[in-house]
Amino acid sequence: SQVSQNCHNGSYEISVLMMGNSAFAEPLKNLEDAVNEGLEIVRGRLQNAGLNVTVNATFMYSDGLIHNSGDCRSSTCEGLDLLRKISNAQRMGCVLIGPSCTYSTFQMYLDTELSYPMISAGSFGLSCDYKETLTRLMSPARKLMYFLVNFWKTNDLPFKTYSWSTSYVYKNGTETEDCFWYLNALEASVSYFSHELGFKVVLRQDKEFQDILMDHNRKSNVIIMCGGPEFLYKLKGDRAVAEDIVIILVDLFNDQYFEDNVTAPDYMKNVLVLTLSPGNSLLNSSFSRNLSPTKRDFALAYLNGILLFGHMLKIFLENGENITTPKFAHAFRNLTFEGYDGPVTLDDWGDVDSTMVLLYTSVDTKKYKVLLTYDTHVNKTYPVDMSPTFTWKNSKLPNDITGRGPQ
């Protein structure tokens, strides 16, 4: 049903869903701090633009009695329950920030008349693609898929002269929310990734993964998995690995690889890590000092959600346009705004664009080094290290199928 919005007469409210079930196990207090820091910045920016208005956030908490798993598995109805609560209290703001779980976002989008914008720190799944009033501020699965297909096809770099068309995907069901949906997208038979590959098999058991590492009859040399180095070590340990195996470790929200004193463990030598380019000032920022690298990105997405709202509010107010209109609800896309840590670009469907970074372990220095970067906005690869000190033969990535000749 239509809910009146607290969104006029110089007073603009943001509804922030503080859900018990969240994409990342982040204390709600930290998210509140991120939102409040964002509000301070927005107020300053509006004031500097000569706009004398009030911007506040209302934090809507779930009672946590029914939906208490803490992860996203029981989030489907929690979002709707919170919306009902907002509806009953007649307290809808101009914009809704949260939820972060794909299940809840999908359900909320499906079951409500969305005449207001929804900003999510998460909602990674393909089912949340192409939603007209949904903006996602953490890289969704679709972006990962486009990178992987682009990289698989690449055969014109001195370190990658074979096009790949095969892959194993390791997915054992214990993944974090982001990894769950990333791997889910790769597994889906109708996805772009599956469509572009000739062979793809999902490995669900640890033993399956371990056996592939030395199996002479394996159908692909490439294995995609999602998580951090520790996750890989638990699975792989110090087992021998065939020389032409390439493990692609998707670990987008982890800037530890870029810290100066980090040395890559030996078990990472056959691994290419896909992560996001780290922010410039985040490591020392006030709101992120107590956060782990993953949680920094999650809290940052909440903060940037506030800044995005401020950006749109400023534009509409300067143009003398109404905020409580479908036009406003549909405007949170195809734009670049000044985020907490520099410009943030949203694509035509409101999904954040980013620079993905592919790292390798240098056999010389035992350090993580940047192999290439990939701009998701233009789907373009930028090679960085043209002569990487790989573990693989001839400093080239191997063919994806053992014994297949040059291409």
Epitope: N155, D156, L157, F159, T373, T381, P383, V384, M386, S387
Partner: antibody, heavy 118, light 106 residues
Framework: EVQLVQSGAEVKKPGASVKVSCKAS????????MNWVKQAPGQRLEWMGV????????NYNQKFKDKATITRDTSASTAYMELSSLRSEDTAVYYC???????????WGQGTTVTVSS | DIQLTQSPSFLSASPGDRVTITCSAS?????MYWYQQKPGSSPKSWIY???NLAQGVPSRFSGSGSGTEYTLTISSLQPEDFATYYC?????????FGGGTKVEIK
Amino acid sequence: EVQLVQSGAEVKKPGASVKVSCKASGYTFTDHNMNWVKQAPGQRLEWMGVMNPKFGTINYNQKFKDKATITRDTSASTAYMELSSLRSEDTAVYYCARDNYPNYFDYWGQGTTVTVSS
Amino acid sequence: DIQLTQSPSFLSASPGDRVTITCSASSSVNYMYWYQQKPGSSPKSWIYRTSNLAQGVPSRFSGSGSGTEYTLTISSLQPEDFATYYCQQYHDYPPTFGGGTKVEIK
């Protein structure tokens, strides 16, 4: 419009060093690798090395590893190549060339002539 | 290093002629790149990834080939096409150039 403007011609004595600059404009300097290429009189083009301005990664052609040192100043959008212990065979035109993968070397500087003569 | 051998080294032709330049690689490469250079000027990107014309290159130019043999073809030579053409590979590190083919007016 993309432009790579190199420093002027240099005449050096054997044993000396020379530093050639290449100022980039018309694009984001840190987005693209910068290559250096040598063209000695009557010789084929020779690739010397490449630098990624964003991460500072440098790859040298083994042949020029002890001859050339590539650096950059990102704030000035400028790449540099220093040639040391100059000899007569270092007499050549040196070019910087932007890498715009998949079109390698898509824009070239106008070249800097280095003459080594006693 | 991969060696690139261009043939011919010199080529005399008249405007309107069809001209073919060949580049042979000492081992197989996936793609070939071509550059045009005029006297006193720096090289210009001409053809990349074997057959893609660089920006501003006329459609009378074409590139083809695979493995170790690649060609640049000018379907109808124009006065402004008289220059030296170089092939280049980046399949293996380091990238290497051919010795050049000088196209002169007959």
